[in-house]
């Protein structure tokens, strides 16, 4: 808290300019009018104010706007945004995408801070859904943003926004998140032809059900092993050897290197050894010839 002292003669600030960097903290407090600061916020970022000086400027704005800053001030906070607490930000009503971009730019190159997370949360809640332009902006600044949302939050993403998603945006998503995103992606890309569709849907396939994988296997898609390894185990298990062979195309040879890892390991255990042998990869662990396979899960469902 800065003590209230009178402004020395001739030091009253008539505008926010670079001469203020030579003001001591108490001089800034005494000589800079909060209303002047609010109307000239766009100048603050152009001036190398120190950490301590920014504290004083924030204090002045807090006194002027105890209920929260107006968007006209928020948009021009610049480095002063780094001084804001999540509690400060919860008082704001940010509706403009330009304001969001301006504040994300301040934090660019750094991990998402609690301030940024709160800002994004306020913005998205204010809009009611994660529209394409917002998603475009957020994933440009934070590629992992989408995967930081809960499945419940992801459910508010409209299918049209999926066009903004890049493969790297889904790198850290878990199966529960992909379960929500996959149907949206399927809907978004439904009018594309086979090969183009596969390129777009590929990153989302970790949420695909068995029937969709079976359908893809009929389209000569040549899925790579990295994508196959991210598929849901429960979706892969019912696939036949022939279907997996068609799905992977020339990449089928990669199964050998992955035979001890899920979902390949679990899938092998479900296949007849005879069928596995037709691949000529030396995959071992299938059901020996002459054994009967009982699908207990089906039996449980019926009882």
């Amino acid at each position: 808290e800065v003590e209230k002292t009178a402004c020395p003669s001739g030091k009253k600030a008539r505008e926010i300019d670079e001469s203020l960097i030579f003001y001591k903290k108490w001089e800034l407090e005494a000589c800079v009018d909060a209303a002047l600061l609010a109307t000239q916020m766009d100048r603050v970022n152009a001036i190398p104010f120190t950490y301590e000086q920014l504290d004083v400027l924030k204090h002045k704005l807090d006194e002027l706007y105890p209920q929260g800053y107006p968007e006209s001030v928020i948009q021009h906070l610049g480095y002063l945004f780094l001084k804001m607490s999540p509690e400060d930000i919860r008082k704001w009503n940010v509706t403009s995408l330009e304001t969001l971009k301006a504040l994300l730019e301040v934090n660019k190159g750094h991990e998402m801070s609690p301030q940024v997370a709160t800002l994004i949360d306020r913005f998205v809640k204010g809009r009611g859904q994660l529209d394409k332009d917002t998603l475009d902006t957020l994933t440009a600044f934070y590629p992992g943003y989408l995967c930081s949302l809960s499945p419940e939050e992801l459910s508010s993403v409209p299918p049209s926004s999926i066009w903004a998603v890049r493969p790297q945006d889904l790198d850290t998503c878990d199966p529960r998140q992909l379960d929500v995103l996959y149907p949206k992606a399927r809907l978004a890309f439904q009018n594309m032809n086979g090969s183009e569709y596969f390129v777009k849907i590929q990153s989302f396939l970790g949420g695909a059900p068995t029937e969709d994988l079976k359908a893809l296997s009929q389209q000569n898609v040549s899925m790579d092993l990295a994508t196959f390894m991210k598929l849901r185990t429960d979706a892969v298990l019912p696939l036949t050897v022939a279907e997996v062979q068609k799905l992977l195309g020339p990449h089928v040879e990669g199964l050998k290197a992955e035979e001890r890892h899920r979902p390949v390991r679990d899938w092998i255990l479900r296949q007849r050894q005879d069928d596995l042998d037709t691949l000529g990869l030396g995959l071992q662990g299938g059901i020996p010839n002459g054994y009967l396979v009982l699908d207990l899960s089906m039996q449980e469902a019926l009882s």
Epitope: E18, A46, I47, P48, F49, Y51, E52, L54, K83
Partner: nanobody, 114 residues
Framework: VQLVESGGGLVQPGGSLRLSCAAS????????VAWYRQAPGEQREPVAA???????IYADSVKGRFTISRDNAKNTVYLQMNSLKPEDTAVYYC??????????WGQGTSVTVS
């Protein structure tokens, strides 16, 4: 992001030195920057500043003797110090943008006028 100041040393009164400050990333090309100094037992004070628009300003004590400049291509800020006086003896620091706002500082470079 790191700040590395250099160019300090021992110089006689009336002499000159050119200080350099390099930053990793493209920090200086987009931000307002400043040189500060801290004499023994004193608080750190601004000496010269350049706004993001390129206008410069100097402390009264160094006006006409010091010049701040920057080379965006090299991401470096300079302080040309002429007609040095014993009272210019201090550790000199540069800073700007995000680092300044978050109170991160480099090691500084020591200038002794004697």
């Amino acid at each position: 992001v790191q700040l590395v100041e250099s160019g300090g040393g021992l110089v006689q009164p009336g002499g000159s030195l050119r200080l350099s400050c390099a930053a990793s990333g493209s920090m200086f090309s987009i931000n307002a920057v400043a040189w500060y100094r801290q004499a023994p037992g004193e608080q750190r004070e601004p000496v010269a500043a350049m706004t993001s628009g390129g206008s410069t300003i100097y402390a009264d004590s160094v006006k006409g003797r010091f010049t701040i400049s920057r080379d965006n291509a090299k991401n470096t800020v300079y302080l040309q110090m002429n007609s040095l006086k014993p009272e210019d003896t201090a550790v000199y620091y540069c800073n700007g943008g995000w680092l300044l706002a978050m109170d991160y500082w480099g090691q500084g470079t020591s200038v002794t006028v004697s």
